[in-house]
Interface confidence: low
């Protein structure tokens, strides 16, 4: 837009120069014509004026077609003095001042139009700039807003995790305390009874049970890996959560399958048991029959 401004100013200057030049031409013509015969001079001046106007109109038309001219130099006027101007009848006098005034008015109007167009463009550009600034500001505000929300959410999430951790730890401690209390109560009972055999039996039993529990713990430990999540970022945590969810989903499916299998096996055992019972009944009956037969 700065370049446009410069070009426009240049064009304005050029037009002013052209106007001044024309004025000088007319003034020169007037001086010459005063010296020459009045009628001829008037006719000649009018013809030259007409030609000058035609020349300029042609030039303007060309400029309108080709767009603004690269070179800003004023073009030389080409008058044709060898052509004989038409005679103006006596009594008709050309008003040079009027022609000049109209000419100046036309130039001034054009200039005014150019200036207005220039300022209109400038105003539009300024408005666009303001609008752009507004939008940039707004985006900045929106992004800050989104960032603030994200930070809030992150804080909430961290708090939730912290609460969850605290709750788990508390539960763990409570369970430990409960186990310790039970063990103590059990040990007190054993000491109080003083039955060595019973104690030995109990120890054997509890030892056996302990082994089963150990087995269970071992299996669970293998399945339940340590949840090291402190170093993970939000996306990784989300992935981890999905992973855990999937493993729970798989375990549930596995559990369901095992339960179904267990039901099936239970059913089969019952079928077999019934079959055995039936066989036993049959064999008992047969046995009795044989004996009876023998004793008879």
């Amino acid at each position: 837009s700065d370049i446009e401004e410069v070009v426009e100013e240049y064009e304005e200057e050029e037009q002013e120069e052209a106007a001044v030049e024309e004025e000088e031409d007319w003034r020169e013509d007037e001086d010459e014509q005063e010296e020459a015969a009045e009628e001829d001079a008037e006719a000649e001046a009018e013809t030259e004026e007409t030609r000058a106007e035609e020349d300029e109109e042609e030039e303007e038309a060309k400029e309108a077609e080709d767009g603004p001219m690269e070179e800003s130099k004023p073009k030389p006027r080409s008058f044709m003095p060898n052509l004989v101007p038409p005679k103006i009848p006596d009594g008709e006098r050309v008003d040079f001042d009027d022609i000049h005034r109209k000419r100046m008015e036309k130039d001034l109007n054009e200039l005014q139009a150019l200036i207005e167009a220039h300022f209109e463009n400038r105003k539009k550009e300024e408005e666009e700039l303001v609008s752009l600034k507004d939008r940039i500001e707004r985006r900045r505000a929106e992004r800050a807003e989104q960032q603030r929300i994200r930070n809030e959410r992150e804080k909430e999430r961290q708090n939730r995790l912290a609460e969850e951790r605290a709750r788990r730890e508390e539960e763990e401690n409570r369970r430990k305390a409960e186990d310790a209390r039970k063990k103590k109560a059990l040990s007190n009972m054993m000491h109080f009874g003083g039955y060595i055999q019973k104690q030995a039996q109990t120890e054997r039993k509890s030892g056996k049970r302990q082994t089963e529990r150990e087995k269970k713990k071992k299996i669970l430990a293998e399945r339940r890996k340590v949840l090291a999540i402190d170093h993970l970022n939000e996306d990784q945590l989300r992935e981890k959560a999905k992973e855990l969810w999937q493993s729970i989903y798989n375990l549930e499916a596995e559990k369901f399958d095992l339960q179904e299998k267990f039901k099936q096996q239970k059913y089969e055992i019952n079928v077999l048991r019934n079959r055995i019972n039936d066989n036993q009944k049959v064999s008992k009956t047969r046995g009795k029959a044989k004996v009876t037969g023998r004793w008879k």
Epitope: D134, R135, E142, R143, E145, Q146, I149, R238
Partner: antibody, heavy 114, light 111 residues
């Protein structure tokens, strides 16, 4: 709890104008832009514009620039949208929303019919 | 304006299966490492409800079976396993550039 309570349904004649409201509660009204969204029957959603409750600064979707005028009243934590030169094309559900479309009003149904 | 094209327009998924909705933007909605893409769920007679913000961040209180992914111009919303209550219309929406625009919507039915 963030809540946006919108004014009731409107039935207006073509050529008339209408002004609907959206009363905010449960948060600091000036903290977030108030957004307005149009949903024509069975169609998708269109963003109309935003207003900054702090200074009344507005941002419009060019499509609605001559149709909607957004204003706010800080004292009552209420945002307003005026729709002018109504035609049947303006019949729709209009929602207000805030905090980057996080919370929404229940919507105001506008019916333009002669 | 950024045009968001959602596909498919409607989708029927069996209970417990996976539903995937795609959203393509006519130009990138990324800015400074963040994708400004949101996903909404809308049930009949209710306002939209935001499920996902910034392409993959789950809104608090939204079940983990909803997930979003993508960046630049290609985004997707996944629901797995689909539940009865997920029957609704889903919209993607970009908030990276004025005017904010929404996708045409995808209607999800549960078989």
């Amino acid at each position: 709890e963030v809540q946006l309570q919108q004014s009731g349904p409107e039935l207006v004649k073509p050529g008339a104008s209408v002004k609907m409201s959206c009363k905010a509660s449960g948060y600091t009204f000036t903290d977030y832009y108030m957004k307005w969204v149009k949903q024509s029957h069975g169609k998708s959603l269109e963003w109309i514009g935003d207003i900054n409750p702090n200074n009344g600064e507005t941002f419009y979707n060019q499509k609605f620039k001559d149709k909607a005028t957004l204003t706010v009243d800080k004292s009552s934590s209420t945002a307003y949208m005026q729709l002018n030169s109504l035609t049947s094309e303006d019949s729709a559900v209009y929602y207000c929303a805030t905090r980057v479309f996080d919370f929404w009003g229940q919507g105001t149904t506008l019916t333009v019919s002669s | 304006d950024i045009v968001l094209t959602q596909s498919p327009a409607s989708l029927a998924v069996s209970l417990g299966q996976r539903a995937t909705i795609s959203c393509k933007a006519s130009q990138s909605v990324d800015y400074d490492g963040t994708s400004y893409m949101n996903w909404f769920q809308q049930k009949a007679g209710q306002p939209p409800k935001r499920l996902i913000y910034a392409a993959s961040n789950l809104e608090s209180g939204i079940p983990a079976r909803f997930s979003g992914r993508g960046s630049g111009t290609d985004f997707a919303l996944n629901i797995h396993p689909v539940e009865e209550e997920d029957a609704a219309t889903y919209y993607c929406q970009q908030s990276n550039e004025d005017p904010y625009t929404f996708g045409g919507g995808t209607k999800l039915e549960i078989k």
